[in-house]
């Protein structure tokens, strides 16, 4: 079965930046990744970045880059500042569309008893949506 | 299909505004950004910027900023592309698009004239 | 910004004619993550919008004829037309798909000899 992880980590340097990671351990191939903050895309959350393997990045404020790590993991890097800044228990979701499981989407947030620049290894985080 | 429907040609004057639309069939409109692009002959094809119908998330080219406004109406599917204080420069065809520019509306004919 | 640069501005060819056309690129386009290259092709023709042929550097829109191939990577890219028609008569843009903002190369406009 198809998993998702999530990973988010406060950089040291700037309390108010932070970085996501997640990846799919699937056999399938990538078409297209989605991550939103706030919950699931489509739930009440909203899109932080769009990325295609081989059409192009999209992404908005206040994600600064979002970019692919692997053939099957991305990263996104968030600048804090002002109103559209994330805070310490916020929600980041990916979703990841892959043919032919279908989508598969979870989310994670920064562990409660994380320093700065700290942050728990990459584990599958509870698959929340599979849409078949 | 994926289909993008834009509004009419507009003949206005120097210091005026006009609003562009662009209506999405076909697709989730809220999933995709939309495009915006400008059209002059002899100047090629310049992004203007985009918009992401669900949260109306938008992205500017530095160059239109001040002169382009983008908003989008999920419940309509249709995103509007406003331009202010038209001078001849702006005269020019302007698309919309979609899906990493896969698609495109028709265009529509901005004449900027006194 | 990444300028694209195009080259030749225009072309003149036969029918049945190979053609290749150039565009570089003043930043890489590679994505390292996932070694896939952010470029696009169009080709436009007169009254109407520009039509998505390449992306990714190399991989067809659907649609696509299989006479149109798309090479390269880094900052140097090739659009080659292995047997030109008359319907392919058309100026054909590249475009960074990389970084915002996305922009276009000035064109490269393909006539009949």
């Known amino acids: 079965t198809p998993e998702v992880w999530v990973q988010v980590r406060m950089e040291a340097t700037e309390l108010s930046s932070f970085t996501i990671r997640c990846g799919f351990l699937g056999s399938g191939s990538i078409s297209l990744v989605t991550v939103s903050w706030g919950g699931p895309n489509g739930a009440g959350g909203t899109t932080l970045a769009v990325l295609h393997p081989e059409r192009g990045i999209r992404q908005w404020a206040p994600a600064r880059q979002a970019r692919w790590e692997t053939q099957s993991s991305i990263s996104l890097i968030l600048e804090g500042s002002g109103a559209s800044s994330p805070c310490a228990n916020t929600t980041f979701c990916c979703k990841f569309a892959s043919f032919p499981e279908g989508s598969w989407e979870a989310c994670g947030s920064l562990p409660p008893s994380s320093d700065p620049g700290l942050s728990a290894p990459p584990t599958p985080a509870p698959i929340l949506r599979a849409d078949l | 299909q994926v289909q993008l429907q834009q509004s009419g040609a507009e003949l206005t004057k120097p210091g005026a505004s006009v609003k562009i639309s662009c209506k999405a069939t076909?697709?989730?409109?809220?999933?995709?950004?939309i495009d915006w692009i400008k059209q002059r002959p002899g100047h090629g094809l310049a992004w203007i910027g985009e918009?992401?119908?669900?949260?109306?998330?938008?992205n500017y080219n530095e160059k239109f900023k001040g002169k382009a406004t983008f908003t989008a109406d999920t419940s309509s599917n249709t995103a509007y592309m406003h331009l202010s204080s038209l001078t001849s420069e702006d005269s020019a065809v302007y698309y919309c698009?979609?899906?990493?520019?896969?698609?495109w509306g028709q265009g529509t004919l901005v004449t900027v004239s006194a | 910004d990444i300028v694209m640069t195009q080259s030749p501005s225009s072309l003149s060819v036969s029918a049945g004619e190979k053609v290749t056309m150039s565009c570089k690129s003043s930043?890489?386009?590679?994505?390292?993550?996932?070694?896939?290259?952010?470029l696009a092709w169009y080709q436009q023709k007169p009254g109407q919008p520009p039509k998505l042929l390449m992306y990714?550097?190399?991989t067809r829109e659907s649609g696509v004829p299989d006479r149109f191939t798309g090479s390269g990577s880094g900052t140097d890219f090739t659009l080659t037309i292995s047997s030109v028609q008359a319907e392919d008569l058309a100026v054909y843009y590249c475009?960074?798909?990389?970084?915002?903002?996305?922009?276009f190369g000035a064109g490269t406009k393909l006539e009949l000899k």
């Open positions: 076909g697709y989730t409109f809220s999933t995709f950004a």
């Open positions: 698009s979609t899906y990493w520019f896969a698609y």
């Open positions: 990714g550097a190399s």
């Open positions: 475009q960074n798909a990389h970084s915002y903002p996305p922009a």
């Open positions: 930043q890489s386009l590679l994505n390292s993550g996932n070694q896939k290259n952010y």
């Open positions: 918009i992401l119908p669900g949260g109306n998330n938008t």
